[in-house]
């Protein structure tokens, strides 16, 4: 092992290295000094480091560490950020197509229900989008609102087209009758089940991806402790004080230091593993009624069938509703 | 039967239902993401080793620095923390994670709980229950064609519904990502403030 530089040697090489970190040479001694004020790079003999240099080395070491951490997570961060954005947009595209399919079904099969049907369908799918993005909306309420809104228009336009333009009082009665008489059969319940399950899973999937980004961002921007900074300085820079510029830290020593510095971060590992495995389980289960693409793009067909169900039972329903909402209708005719 | 709005929106660029095999769907995209994520399953436990391998460490040199002195790479002194009197490495480990790390661990625990709840078969109303409602047709197999919608002639089959890559503005291949390959990152000159 080479002895420390003799006291008469200059610190010229150390100065030129340090200048890259800190322009201005006033902190580097001309010749090696005892270094009794040093706190991290404790010298065994004369040293080319000063207290100010040591502080700068600590700052640089912590900065290096932060940069290394960020470069380590770059690929993972990019993967999750880009996927979160792509899936969010893909889900929006599905919602848009589902809305267009449903509007097309109304336009082609029930033109007399438009444009109001477009309005109710539009509001429904707006709520679907908001729910996926985390809004506090109840899916069952959304579906109920869709059918509650559709029924008065179906009743006044398809089943009883002789009625004058629907007024609020008969509409309210018809909305109530829709649920009481189960005019759409079990279709609303079927849609509720399928939509709520597929949207719940979709929402959690997006939430999980966004949390993944948050996890990486958190560990990406960790500020390392002073103790860690001292350990890193000793590992990366203290050799400079002895004029050993080209020497590198020992591998085993580096691992010990890194484990010390990153003890807190490594605690995430267990939960991170579980996160990826749980996400995999969720993804494996995203099919049929748990797949929003499948459910939403088929909604137009189920809604069509539900209207056919109403039409099939129109005779019976008109009689019952005629009695049930008679008071509202009389008020409307006056 | 329900008019199927397949060719209604050609001018509106609505994606038509795809009848071509092997087209990319959302579900295949999700599975692809999981496969890529699984390659990062040990990300946090491997971090200390990764950082050492991407910062200047002695690999081919005979001598290396142990924090206090120059030693032979394979000597016992090489792995020892040179400044053992300065402060205790064990103490540093015992401090526990920072508050921000504790917070993120709590959030991970919560999402993991949610994910598990959603994935649990017993937590689900399975398709079987819907069959009892009498709305699903019996001729719907478990092949890649999915049953959509209600009964009778309103039923349509949709194969590999949407091709999202065609419509999304950006490609998802991480191969083009900046700094994507952990292996290829240059070690010694990666961080500008290292001067070795």
């Amino acid at each position: 092992q080479p002895p420390p530089p003799p006291p008469d040697a200059t610190c010229h090489q150390v100065r030129s290295f340090f200048q890259r970190l800190q322009p201005g040479l006033k902190w580097v001694p001309e010749t090696p000094v005892p270094g009794s004020d040093l706190q991290v790079c404790l010298p065994k003999g004369p040293t080319c480091c000063s207290r100010k240099m040591e502080e700068k080395y600590q700052l640089t070491a912590r900065l290096n560490m932060e940069q290394l951490l960020q470069s380590a997570s770059m690929e993972l961060k990019f993967l999750i950020i880009q996927n979160a954005a792509v899936f969010q947009e893909a889900f929006e595209i599905v919602v848009r197509h589902a809305k267009n399919y449903t509007n097309a079904m109304f336009k082609n099969n029930y033109p007399s229900l438009t444009p109001q049907a477009f309005e109710f369908v539009g509001e429904f799918f707006t709520d679907v989008s908001l729910y996926i993005l985390g809004s506090d909306i109840n899916v069952d309420d959304m579906v109920n609102e869709l059918f509650d809104s559709l029924f008065p228009v179906i009743y006044t336009q398809l089943m009883n087209p002789g009625l004058p333009d629907s007024a609020l009082d008969i509409n309210e009665c018809l909305r109530g009758a829709r649920r009481d008489l189960k005019v759409f059969g079990n279709f609303p319940k079927l849609i509720m089940t399928q939509v709520s399950k597929s949207l719940q899973v979709t929402r959690i999937f997006l939430q999980a991806l966004n949390l993944g980004i948050e996890v990486i961002n958190t560990t990406d921007h960790l500020k390392f402790s002073k103790d860690c900074g001292r350990m890193l300085t000793r590992m990366w820079y203290c050799s400079y004080c002895q004029g050993l510029m080209m020497v590198k830290p020992c591998g085993g020593y580096c691992n010990v230091v890194m484990q010390g510095c990153m003890a807190g971060v490594v605690e995430i590992d267990k939960y991170w593993r579980e996160y990826i495995l749980s996400l995999e389980e969720l993804v494996n289960g995203m099919y049929r009624i748990y797949d929003m693409e499948n459910v939403l793009l088929g909604l137009f067909s189920t809604i069509h069938d539900s209207i056919q169900y109403v039409q099939k039972n129109a005779g019976k329903l008109t009689t019952t509703i005629g009695k049930l909402c008679a008071h509202s209708q009389q008020r409307q005719y006056r | 039967s329900a008019y199927y709005p397949e060719d209604l929106f050609i001018d509106k660029k609505v994606l038509k239902v795809a009848h071509v095999e092997h087209e990319e769907t959302l579900s295949s995209r999700r599975r692809e993401l999981i496969q890529k994520l699984k390659s990062f399953i040990s990300f946090y436990s491997a971090l200390p080793g990764y950082i050492c391998s991407h910062s200047p460490v002695a690999e081919n040199d005979t001598l290396c620095w142990n924090g206090q002195e120059l030693v032979e790479r394979y000597s016992q002194k090489a792995a020892r923390n040179g400044m053992k009197n300065q402060f205790n490495l064990h103490e540093l480990k015992m401090k526990g994670p920072e508050p921000v790390v504790s917070q993120i661990i709590d959030k991970l625990k919560h999402i993991n709980q949610l994910l598990r709840t959603m994935s649990m078969p017993k937590g689900r109303v399975l398709d079987k229950n819907l069959d009892e409602e009498g709305f699903e047709s019996g001729d719907c197999g478990d092949d890649e064609d999915e049953c959509i919608g209600g009964s009778g002639d309103g039923m349509i089959k949709v194969k590999n519904q949407l091709r999202f890559l065609a419509e999304l503005a950006y490609d998802l291949d991480v191969d083009d990502a900046p700094g994507n390959s952990q292996q290829a990152t240059p070690k010694d000159n990666e961080i500008s403030t290292f001067h070795n």
Epitope: A85, Q88, E89, E92, I93, V95, R96, N103, T114, P115, Q116, F118, E119, V121, G122, E123, T126, S129, L130, L133, E145, S149, P152, D165, S166, L168, N171 | K12, K13
Partner: antibody, heavy 119, light 107 residues
Framework: EVQLVESGGGLVQPGGSLRLSCAAS????????MNWVRQAPGKGLEWVSY????????KYADSVKGRFTISRDNAKNSLFLQMNSLRDEDTAVYYC????????????WGQGTMVTVSS | EIVLTQSPATLSLSPGERATLSCRAS??????LAWYQQKPGQAPRLLIY???NRATGIPARFSGSGSGTDFTLTISSLEPEDFAVYYC?????????FGQGTKVEIK
């Protein structure tokens, strides 16, 4: 001809009230969602409020919430905006606009009515 | 709320020239984007809906494109009556918001 005609604008003091009306013709008013959109002098467009055809959904911009009330009378083909606690920054041309859900756009606009809030 | 940023603020062109107006959303709006034209003292008029579809009666020289966060309105060959202010508007999320406008003026 599809038409929307606003009325009721004028000069009012800060803290005062005003009621705007919009008369619709040429389409089935009771089937469409309606909105108020405003434009301050020399500035851009700002959505103010939305009401569904059956009045079951009503939405407001944060800037007017609690001060403005949107309503409609389908029997009279009319849309209203009751504006209370008016502020200087409410000075604008107020447009009545039909929302077409199939297009996801404001497809029909009135010519606007000027509201000036000044002491 | 989603912020729409239009650029440029002013576009000085001559009749017959091609005008390209840009609208950028602060987050994805899918294709829920419309374009309006407004002339001095007049109400806005719908030009394009769903990012790329021309409204009834709008000449073919007007075209829209884009999806997600970046959208473009193109007027292939400016006519004298096209000099006006153009606004983009999103409906992906409530509230519906408008861009600050791009003024297309005669050079």
């Amino acid at each position: 001809e599809v038409q929307l005609v606003e009325s009721g604008g004028g000069l009012v003091q800060p803290g005062g009230s005003l009621r705007l009306s919009c008369a619709a013709s040429g389409f089935t008013f009771s089937s469409y969602s309606m909105n108020w959109v405003r434009q301050a002098p020399g500035k851009g467009l700002e959505w103010v409020s939305y009401i569904r055809s059956d009045s079951r959904t009503i939405k407001y911009a944060d800037s007017v919430k609690g001060r403005f009330t949107i309503s409609r009378d389908n029997a009279k083909n009319s849309l209203f905006l009751q504006m209370n606690s008016l502020r200087d920054e409410d000075t604008a041309v107020y447009y009545c606009a039909r929302w077409e859900w199939e297009l996801d756009a404001f497809d029909i606009w009135g010519q606007g009515t000027m509201v000036t809030v000044s002491s | 709320e989603i912020v729409l940023t239009q650029s440029p603020a002013t576009l000085s062109l001559s009749p017959g020239e091609r005008a390209t107006l840009s609208c950028r959303a602060s987050q994805s709006v899918s294709s829920y984007l419309a374009w309006y034209q407004q002339k001095p003292g007049q109400a806005p008029r719908l030009l394009i809906y769903d990012a790329s579809n021309r409204a009834t009666g709008i000449p073919a020289r007007f075209s829209g494109s884009g999806s997600g966060t970046d959208f473009t309105l193109t007027i292939s060959s400016l006519e004298p009556e096209d000099f006006a202010v153009y606004y983009c508007q999103q409906r992906s999320n409530w509230p519906p918001t408008f861009g600050q406008g791009t003024k297309v003026e005669i050079k």
